[in-house]
C-alpha cells in the first residue's frame, strides 16, 4: 500500500494485495470493500465507486466478510427430536442439536442433520461406553460379580451386594439376595451358605436369551465380543 492510506476503491500497487476487509474486483481491477457479516453486495464496485452493501433479508444470513450477491438461506426449522441452540439471524445460520437422550447420527458443518435415540442396555447388560453428542451408547454383558436390572442408556453394571449368607445368588440381571438371619446350623430351605470371607462376591450366572429353571451352563461357553445390537433394546 502507498504511504498515504488508500480508500476503497483503489488500484493496488504491483505485487501487493488488498487488505483483509477488501477483495480484488477483476472487472474494475480495484481493491474494493467487502460487506460485513449480515450483509451482501447489492452493487459491485467500479473504478470510481465502492461496493454498496445491503442487509440480509429475513431467514437469510452471511457469517463472514463477503461480496456475495445474495445472502445464504438459513436451514429448515429444527425437527421434533432436536433443539434450536442458535437462532437464524442475519449473521448466523440456525443450529439444531439433538435433544437429551438422542445423539447425532448424521452431522453437518454446524449442528446435526439426523438425530437417533440413544441405545438402551437391557437387563444383564450395562453401559460400556456412554453416548455422546455424536456417538451411540455401547453395551456390554455384566461380568461375573456384577449386574444390571434396568433398561437404561446410562446405567452401568454394578457389583452384587456382599452377603454373609446368600439367600439367592446374584446373576447378570439380578442382585444377590442375602438372608437376614445370622448363619446357623439349620439353614432356611434353598439358602446357600458360603464358607468364605465376607469380601467374596456372590455366585454369578451369565444372562441367557431365554428364562430357564435349569442350571445355567453359559459360563462354560467362550465369552467373545457380543454383536453390536446385543444387550440393547430398540425403544
Amino acid at each position: 500500500l502507498p504511504a498515504q492510506v488508500a480508500f476503497t476503491p483503489y488500484a493496488p500497487e504491483p505485487g501487493s494485495t488488498c487488505r483483509l476487509r477488501e477483495y480484488y474486483d477483476q472487472t474494475a481491477q480495484m481493491c474494493c470493500s467487502k460487506c460485513s457479516p449480515g450483509q451482501h453486495a447489492k452493487v459491485f464496485c467500479t473504478k470510481t465507486s465502492d461496493t454498496v452493501c445491503d442487509s440480509c433479508e429475513d431467514s437469510t444470513y452471511t457469517q463472514l466478510w463477503n461480496w456475495v450477491p445474495e445472502c445464504l438461506s438459513c436451514g429448515s426449522r429444527c425437527s421434533s427430536d432436536q433443539v434450536e441452540t442458535q437462532a437464524c439471524t442475519r449473521e448466523q445460520n440456525r443450529i439444531c442439536t439433538c435433544r437429551p437422550g438422542w445423539y447425532c447420527a448424521l452431522s453437518k458443518q454446524e449442528g446435526c442433520r439426523l438425530c437417533a435415540p440413544l441405545r438402551k442396555c437391557r437387563p444383564g447388560f450395562g453401559v460400556a461406553r456412554p453416548g455422546t453428542e455424536t456417538s451411540d451408547v455401547v453395551c456390554k454383558p455384566c461380568a461375573p460379580g456384577t449386574f444390571s436390572n434396568t433398561t437404561s442408556s446410562t446405567d452401568i453394571c454394578r457389583p452384587h451386594q456382599i452377603c454373609n449368607v446368600v439367600a439367592i445368588p446374584g446373576n447378570a440381571s439380578m442382585d444377590a439376595v442375602c438372608t437376614s438371619t445370622s448363619p446357623t446350623r439349620s439353614m432356611a430351605p434353598g439358602a446357600v451358605h458360603l464358607p468364605q470371607p465376607v469380601s467374596t462376591r456372590s455366585q454369578h450366572t451369565q444372562p441367557t436369551p431365554e428364562p430357564s429353571t435349569a442350571p445355567s451352563t453359559s459360563f462354560l461357553l467362550p465369552m467373545g465380543p457380543s454383536p453390536p445390537a446385543e444387550g440393547s433394546t430398540g425403544d
Epitope: 492510506v5 488508500a6 483483509l20 476487509r21 460485513s36 452493501c53 466478510w65
Partner: antibody, heavy 118, light 110 residues
C-alpha cells in the same frame, strides 16, 4: 488532513450536549467516522460509528444514550442525558472504510473534554 | 459479542528488552485486528492493522502476529519512547458489542 472535536464543556447531569467533529483537508464522502471516549485514567471506549449513507452502529451500552449524525463536513455526537459517569475526553476518529463496522482508525482528533457534574 | 481481553494490564521492560502484549477475542475475528499506541495526554496512534501490517512510519521494532482469537503485539529492542499504553481493536463486528477495544496495556520502560 485532520479531524477536530469541539463542544466539550462542564454540564450538569441531564442537560443534553452535542459535540462536533470537523474534518479538514479531505472529504467525508468515503469514510465512516467513529466516536471514542476515554474517562480519566481509563481505557478507550468505542461509542458508535456513522458512514456516508447515514447508517449508524452503537456499542450496546451507548444505544439510547448517544446519537450520531452528520453533514457534509461535520459529524455530531449528542449525549442525550449526560450522567457523571459520562465525564471523559471524547475523540472522533476517521475509519479507512465506509462500513458501520469499524475497521481501523488512521486519524484521530486531539479530543474534547466533557465534565458532567452538579 | 466480540469481547477483547488484553493482558497484562501493566508490564515493565528494560531499555533494549522485548515486550509482548496479548489480546484475546471471545470468538474468531479473522485477523481483523489493529494495535494503537497512546502516550499520556495525547491522541492514540495507529501502529498495526490486519494483525501484522505496519502502519506508515511505524518502526520495524513493532510487530504483530496471531490468528483466530489470539493476537500478540511484540516490541523488540524497546526504547524509552515506547513507554505508553497500547490498545488492540477488533474490526470484525459491531453487532451487540460493548467495546471494539481491549482494556489496554501500560508499558513501563526502566
Amino acid at each position: 488532513q485532520s479531524v477536530e472535536e469541539s463542544g466539550g464543556r462542564l454540564v450538569t447531569p441531564g442537560t443534553p450536549l452535542t459535540l462536533t467533529c470537523t474534518v479538514s483537508g479531505f472529504s467525508l464522502s468515503s469514510n465512516a467516522i467513529s466516536w471514542v471516549r476515554q474517562a480519566p485514567g481509563k481505557g478507550l471506549e468505542w461509542i458508535g460509528i456513522i458512514n456516508t449513507y447515514d447508517n449508524t452502529a452503537y456499542a450496546t451500552w451507548a444505544k439510547g444514550r448517544f446519537s450520531i449524525s452528520r453533514t457534509s463536513t461535520t459529524v455530531d455526537l449528542k449525549i442525550t442525558s449526560p450522567a457523571t459517569k459520562d465525564t471523559a475526553t471524547y475523540f472522533c476518529a476517521r475509519d479507512v472504510h465506509n462500513n458501520v463496522v469499524p475497521y481501523y482508525f488512521d486519524m484521530w482528533g486531539q479530543g474534547t473534554l466533557v465534565t458532567v457534574s452538579s | 459479542a466480540y469481547d477483547m481481553t488484553q493482558t497484562p494490564a501493566t508490564v515493565e521492560v528494560a531499555v533494549g528488552g522485548t515486550v509482548t502484549i496479548n489480546c484475546q477475542a471471545s470468538q474468531s475475528i479473522s485477523n481483523l485486528l489493529a494495535w494503537y499506541q497512546q502516550k499520556p495526554g495525547q491522541r492514540p496512534k495507529l501502529l498495526i492493522y490486519d494483525t501484522s501490517d505496519l502502519a506508515s512510519g511505524v518502526p520495524s521494532r513493532f510487530s504483530g502476529s496471531g490468528s483466530g482469537t489470539e493476537y500478540t503485539l511484540t516490541i523488540t529492542g524497546v526504547e524509552c519512547a515506547d513507554a505508553a499504553t497500547y490498545y488492540c481493536q477488533q474490526g470484525y463486528s459491531s453487532s451487540n458489542i460493548d467495546n471494539v477495544f481491549g482494556g489496554g496495556t501500560e508499558v513501563v520502560v526502566k
